[in-house]
Interface confidence: medium
């Protein structure tokens, strides 16, 4: 059966300069490729993570992805800032040239609070 | 307090259609995701469709999906569910339900309209 | 599409008993489990969200415990008013949303 990303959360909300979790998990790992988080849709949306070698300040994967048995792909962002806000999607890849995007999650909108 | 109240329920011939309304008050009914929730009679609760609060999404069951069609006007905080090519396993009550805003479960009910399909 | 099994479907107890309803899940729904009670003639009531947390309203006789698969619901004490049909809900797994079949308890 088809790949499912599932993202629990329609929104979050945090204040600003803390950290919040932003869940989503896999049902399989199949077929093989990356899975990357975005803000937004569409030509202009932002690389958030990557679930690679890259390093992307103030986001951090929950779980340890390179664990084979590992279907858990949430993150964490810290130090929130109201440029932060937006709609956050998880998106299962196919490898390939290039990778083809196969799967979205339902996305989380991350609303950030006034300290 | 949050209040939703249906209407349009009735009895139809199978194949016909029938369009059934919810009104909403108490909440924001715009940024609220809204959904159909069916009980046929002596059976248990099925989800049947669901609308984001902007009216952009939609999903449905396979059982309804290509003759039910959901919207919403949110100038009226109204929702809607036209329903076409009715067959006699559609006879059911019907509940307007609204989501929780964090999360898909239903944090209020209407107390439903009834959809009896019989020729 | 996360199938939910309930049991006992029909439950008979005296007012004054503890009620121990079940709801299984076909695959892992973490904590995202909803309790509704729903009574002739009168709208579906949100009793318990996230497998355990009260809805606001909600006597403290009801509580909700479980993960994963299995989750219970428990009236330590039932009431007149609470003899209804008790269904749960995942929603974790994004549409369809799934509830399971229903528990029926009935005054012995």
């Known amino acids: 059966t088809e790949v499912k990303v599932i993202q629990p959360e329609k929104s979050v909300s945090v204040a600003a300069g803390d950290s919040t979790v932003l869940n989503c998990t896999l049902t399989s790992l199949l077929p093989v490729g990356p899975i990357r988080w975005y803000r937004g849709v569409g030509q202009s949306r932002q690389l958030i993570y990557s679930f690679t070698t890259e390093h992307f300040p103030r986001v951090t994967n929950v779980s340890d992805a390179t664990k084979r048995s590992n279907l858990d792909f949430s993150i964490r962002i810290s130090n929130v800032t109201p440029e932060d806000a937006g709609t956050y999607y998880c998106v299962k890849f196919q490898r390939g040239s290039p990778d083809t995007e196969i799967q979205s999650g339902g996305g989380t909108e991350v609303y950030v609070l006034a300290k | 307090d949050v209040q939703l109240v249906e209407s349009g329920g009735g009895v139809v011939r199978p194949g016909e259609s029938l369009r059934l309304s919810c009104a909403a008050s108490?909440?924001?009914?715009?940024?609220?995701?809204m959904n159909w929730v069916r009980q046929a009679p002596g059976e248990g609760l099925e989800w049947v469709s669901l609308?984001?609060?902007?009216?952009?999404?939609?999903y449905y069951a396979d059982s309804v999906k290509g003759r039910f069609t959901i919207s919403r006007d949110n100038s009226k905080n109204t929702l809607y569910l036209q329903m076409n090519s009715l067959r006699a396993e559609d006879t059911a009550v019907y509940y307007c339900?609204?989501?929780?805003?964090?999360?898909?479960?239903?944090?209020?009910w209407g107390l439903g309209t009834l959809v009896t399909v019989s020729s | 599409e996360t199938v939910l099994t309930q049991s006992p479907g029909i439950l008979s107890l005296s007012p004054g008993e503890r009620a121990t309803l079940t709801c299984r899940a076909s695959q892992s729904v973490y904590t995202y489990l909803a309790w509704y009670q729903e009574k002739p003639g009168q709208a579906p009531r949100l009793l318990i969200y996230g497998a355990s947390s009260r809805a606001a309203g909600i006597p403290d006789r009801f509580s909700g415990s479980g993960s994963g698969t299995e989750f219970t619901l428990t009236i330590s004490s039932l009431q007149s008013e609470d003899f209804a049909v008790y269904y749960c809900q995942q929603y974790y797994d994004r549409p369809p949303l799934t509830f399971g079949g229903g528990t029926k308890v009935e005054i012995k």
């Open positions: 339900a609204k989501e929780n805003d964090r999360y898909r479960f239903f944090d209020y």
């Open positions: 609308i984001s609060g902007s009216g952009e999404i939609t």
């Open positions: 108490g909440f924001t009914f715009s940024t609220s995701d």
